[in-house]
């Protein structure tokens, strides 16, 4: 009786969802591996979140906005083990725009999502960032690692969105 | 006082080949984006190509691509377009004008005169 | 590439009369507090004059007649009062994204 109605609520979270995601990719966790945590098709999971990495070519609002119809931020990189696994996705000779920016140019980074800049947890390349006027940031790859360069946030790039788990 | 000044400009026949210069003075030029501004006659205002600060970025709109190249040269504060393979619709009126970023986009602030280029046989 | 219209092509104003002109792109060119719309005037045989960036924010040395407003995809100048030389052409500017677009110009008359 109790699987009976787990399973009734699971499915009415699922068609709640469906509205939004049309595919949903599901593992089960939990130490009883009861918890089903789910990310949109095709997006990949990491740890509590899911991620999208879009090839449409935009400037940083844009890509941002497109983020956001989806449920996600264009994302936030919060540790190393993080940013390792989204770069196993990426394409070395491209950039990608991440959810960070300085609208201002007088070097106060911002994340999207609000969570504070900590300057001990940043990824620049070597001299980076180096001009006010370049206000949005990007990941690419560039002396054998992948980093982080500001750069005009106008100018067209590919994008990473996240979002966190769906549990049902 | 910021002064932007545009020379290069003629008549040139179809196919043809104009060099545009643009010389700064007033400010540092090295600091700032700078862009080329057309406006064919009895028109309005067309972006014809953006260079950043550094050079390491240039842009251009589909009409010119290929055809135009944008360059400068900070030692002799000095803003550049090589227009190559001109047409009849590229006759207008060239306005060198310096960029100011503004939170995500960025405006013009300063413009020279202008240069006039014809293109005709 | 984000079109921007202007409305209307051109009207005359009496003096000391206001003249609004309105800019419309068919996206938004705002995020969050930003309103990445700019305002040119252009007189004849001369180069464009930046009046106000930013949406609403008035360029250091022009007359506080001159106001502007809006957000997302719809903007307005505010000429008010008009004065006689205040006729001129004016364009709106985007670079929320490249390639940077312009209107394509009000022209302002005295009725």
């Known amino acids: 009786n109790f699987m009976y109605s787990k399973t009734v609520k699971r499915l009415s979270k699922l068609q709640e969802y469906q509205q939004y995601y049309p595919s949903l990719t599901c593992v089960m966790e939990g130490k009883d591996m009861e918890d089903w945590s789910c990310c949109p098709t095709p997006w990949t999971s990491f740890q509590s979140s899911c991620y999208f990495i879009s090839t449409v070519m935009q400037s940083w609002t844009k890509s941002q906005n497109n983020c956001s119809v989806m449920g996600a931020d264009l994302v936030v990189i919060n540790t190393k083990e993080e940013q390792d696994f989204i770069t196993q996705n990426l394409k070395i000779n491209s950039a990608y725009f991440l959810g960070l920016s300085d609208p201002k140019g007088w070097r106060h980074w911002q994340w999207v999502d609000q969570t504070p800049y900590n300057k001990n947890v940043t990824f620049w390349h070597s001299g980076e960032p180096n001009s006010p006027d370049e206000r949005c940031a990007i990941i690419n790859f560039r002396s054998e690692e992948w980093g982080w360069n500001d750069v005009h946030c106008h100018v067209p790039q590919k994008s990473i969105c996240k979002m966190k788990k769906i549990y049902i | 006082e910021v002064q932007l000044v545009e020379s290069g400009g003629g008549l040139v026949k179809p196919g043809g080949s104009l060099r545009l210069s643009c010389a700064a003075s007033g400010f540092t030029f090295s600091s700032y984006g700078m862009s080329w501004v057309r406006q064919a006659p009895g028109k309005g205002l067309e972006w014809v190509s953006t260079?950043?600060?550094?050079?390491?970025?240039?842009y251009y709109p589909d009409s010119v691509k290929g055809r135009f190249t944008i360059s400068r040269d900070n030692a002799k504060n000095s803003l550049y377009l090589q227009m190559n393979s001109l047409r009849a619709e590229d006759t207008a009126v060239y306005y060198c004008?310096?960029?100011?970023?503004?939170?995500?986009?960025?405006?013009?602030?300063?413009w020279g005169q202008g240069t006039t280029v014809t293109v005709s046989s | 590439d984000i079109v921007l219209t202007q409305s209307p092509d051109s009207l005359a104003v009496s003096l000391g009369e206001r003249a609004t002109i309105n800019c419309r792109a068919s996206?938004?060119?705002?995020?969050?507090?930003?309103?990445?719309m700019h305002w040119y005037q252009q007189k004849p045989g001369q180069p464009p004059k930046l009046l106000i960036y930013g949406a609403s924010n008035l360029e250091s040395g022009v007359p506080d007649r001159f106001s502007g407003s809006g957000s997302e995809t719809d903007f307005t100048l505010t000429i008010s009062p008009l004065q006689a030389e205040d006729v001129a052409v004016y364009f709106c500017q985007q670079s929320i994204e490249d390639p940077p677009t312009f209107g394509g110009g009000t022209k302002v008359e005295i009725k």
């Open positions: 260079i950043s600060s550094g050079d390491s970025y240039t």
């Open positions: 004008a310096r960029q100011i970023y503004y939170d995500y986009a960025y405006y013009f602030d300063f």
């Open positions: 996206e938004s060119v705002s995020f969050r507090t930003s309103h990445l």
